[in-house]
Interface confidence: low
């Protein structure tokens, strides 16, 4: 629905009248930043504002998911005249301000990236005191986290009529291709569900009917690497055992 104007509008006349970008509200963020899981990434964000010299209190905020309403992952506040932005929130301690908000720079460093960090981030600055202005990037920066495959679950489950099936779930970005190998199988991509709804980096492959005892191996591969895990099926005494 339509966003209300309070806290959601920009000084458009400054945009039109002043040729210097330093004299209007604007925010510069790249469309996307890519980094590998486990590494660190820098989310650049710089801004301009219409106040010639603003030295009052300010707050720098980063939020994830959606602008204006998404959860905050980082927040810091700088007192009047201070160049130090005191961190008030850093989700899981992994977010750190690299830029200096007094120098119109809100760039953020994200440590120890995980695939769950793959989302859009929005920077915001709030001035307080003499002026009550705040501005947030509308489109944000997409953090694209890449990762070599990792098999997160492999299991053998009973099926109707005393049969067994095997499930293999792996994560990675790009989403990995899964293949099964095992007795009388060769290599099989049987019943791959890719990716699971709501779990964008997870891929599951099912072997619907295990016809022979022995070792079944699931291999996950993408452009960054490969991973494999095995389960063992023993049907004597009607039991099954799994080992990875």
């Amino acid at each position: 629905f339509v966003r209300t104007k309070i806290d959601t509008t920009e000084n458009l006349l400054n945009t039109e009248v002043h040729s210097s970008p330093a004299q209007r509200w604007s925010m510069q963020v790249p469309p996307e930043v890519s980094a590998e899981a486990g590494d660190a990434a820098v989310l650049p964000c710089t801004f301009t504002h219409p106040h010639r010299h603003y030295d009052g209190p300010l707050t720098a905020i980063w939020r994830a998911g959606e602008p204006y309403a998404g959860p905050q992952v980082f927040r810091c506040a700088a007192a009047r005249g201070s160049e130090l932005c005191q961190t008030a929130l850093s989700l899981h301690g992994r977010f750190r301000l690299l830029g200096n908000p007094r120098r119109n720079d809100l760039s953020l460093r994200v440590e120890r990236l995980a695939l769950a960090d793959d989302r859009r981030y929005f920077c915001r600055v709030e001035f307080a005191g003499d002026v009550h202005d705040r501005y947030e990037s509308r489109h944000g920066v997409r953090l694209h986290v890449t990762a070599a495959p990792r098999i997160v679950n492999i299991s053998v489950l009973p099926s109707p009529a005393h049969a067994f099936r095997a499930l293999c779930t792996a994560e990675g970005e790009p989403p990995p291709a899964l293949a099964w190998s095992g007795p009388a199988l060769g290599n099989s991509l049987a019943a791959v569900r890719s990716p699971r709804e709501g779990h964008g980096h997870l891929v599951t492959a099912e072997l619907p009917a295990l016809t022979h005892d022995g070792r079944y191996t699931c291999t996950a591969a993408n452009s960054l690497g490969r991973s494999e895990a095995s389960v063992y099926l023993f049907r004597f005494h009607g039991a099954s055992g799994a080992s990875t």
């Epitope: 629905f1 339509v2 966003r3 209300t4 104007k5 309070i6 806290d7 959601t8 509008t9 920009e10 000084n11 458009l12 006349l13 945009t15 509200w25 219409p50 602008p67 204006y68 929005f122 915001r124 009550h132 202005d133 705040r134 501005y135 947030e136 990037s137 509308r138």
Partner: antibody, heavy 123, light 112 residues
Framework: EIQLQQSGAEVKKPGSSVKVSCKAS????????MHWVKQAPGQGLEWIGT????????AYNQKFKGKATLTADRSTSTAYMELSSLRSEDTAVYYC????????????????WGQGTLVTVSS | DIVMTQSPLSLPVTPGEPASISCRST???????????LYWYLQKPGQSPQLLIY???NLASGVPDRFSGSGSGTDFTLKISRVEAEDVGVYYC?????????FGGGTKVEIK
């Protein structure tokens, strides 16, 4: 240069409908909310409602619910207001007006206006 | 709905003299963020309205500095320090605090 170009004057019969257009240029259409304002002959200004061209979301003055329908075509950067079941009291000049916004409170109100469209309802 | 009331209805002015228009709202237009969401527009004869003042006291770009806005949460004033012939028209105040946005009834400024 930002401009809002409205469609020409219309003469309509009571009970009929009319669709007024407002073509925006000089800016990214989806970055502005479009508002519509009514001015009856010799009268003041009345806010009808607004549409967010990016999402199609609308907000109406209760008085104009069921009378005015706001739409927007992003492909042509044009906003529309359709007035239905026209009566003589709908005779007025209708303005579209907009201003840029993003997630900040540094607004300036309705800085840009169309030239107005006169809708005359007469049998 | 917030009701906006303007006075006077008509204001005859002498070029070079000051002029003042009042506007009152039935609810405070002061938001918790410190902004007062009151705006002034001028509609010259045969033209679309144009913005004069935004957020109670900020002069819109291109508007001569003889115009100024002031007020509190519910009582507002538009002042013209020295009226010029081109200032004739109908002046409207408007609240932009909440839907539906509402205008005052207008004040017609004309040269004596």
């Amino acid at each position: 240069e930002i401009q809002l170009q409205q469609s020409g004057a219309e003469v309509k019969k009571p009970g009929s409908s009319v669709k007024v257009s407002c073509k925006a240029s000089g800016y990214t259409f989806t970055d502005y909310d479009m508002h519509w304002v009514k001015q009856a002959p010799g009268q003041g200004l009345e806010w009808i409602g607004t549409i967010d061209p990016e999402t199609g979301g609308t907000a109406y003055n209760q008085k104009f619910k069921g009378k005015a329908t706001l739409t927007a075509d992003r492909s042509t950067s044009t906003a529309y207001m359709e007035l239905s079941s026209l009566r003589s009291e709908d005779t007025a000049v209708y303005y579209c007006t907009s201003f840029y916004y993003t997630y900040s409170n540094y607004d300036v109100g309705f800085a840009y206006w169309g030239q107005g469209t006169l809708v005359t309802v007469s049998s | 709905d917030i009701v906006m009331t303007q006075s006077p209805l008509s204001l005859p002015v002498t070029p070079g003299e000051p002029a003042s228009i009042s506007c009152r709202s039935t609810k405070s237009l002061l938001h918790s963020n410190g902004n007062t969401y009151l705006y002034w527009y001028l509609q010259k004869p045969g033209q679309s309205p144009q913005l004069l003042i935004y957020r109670m006291s900020n002069l819109a770009s291109g508007v001569p500095d003889r115009f100024s806005g002031s007020g509190s949460g519910t009582d507002f004033t538009l002042k013209i320090s020295r009226v010029e012939a081109e200032d004739v028209g109908v002046y409207y105040c408007m609240q932009h605090l909440e839907y539906p946005f509402t205008f005052g009834g207008g004040t017609k400024v004309e040269i004596k």
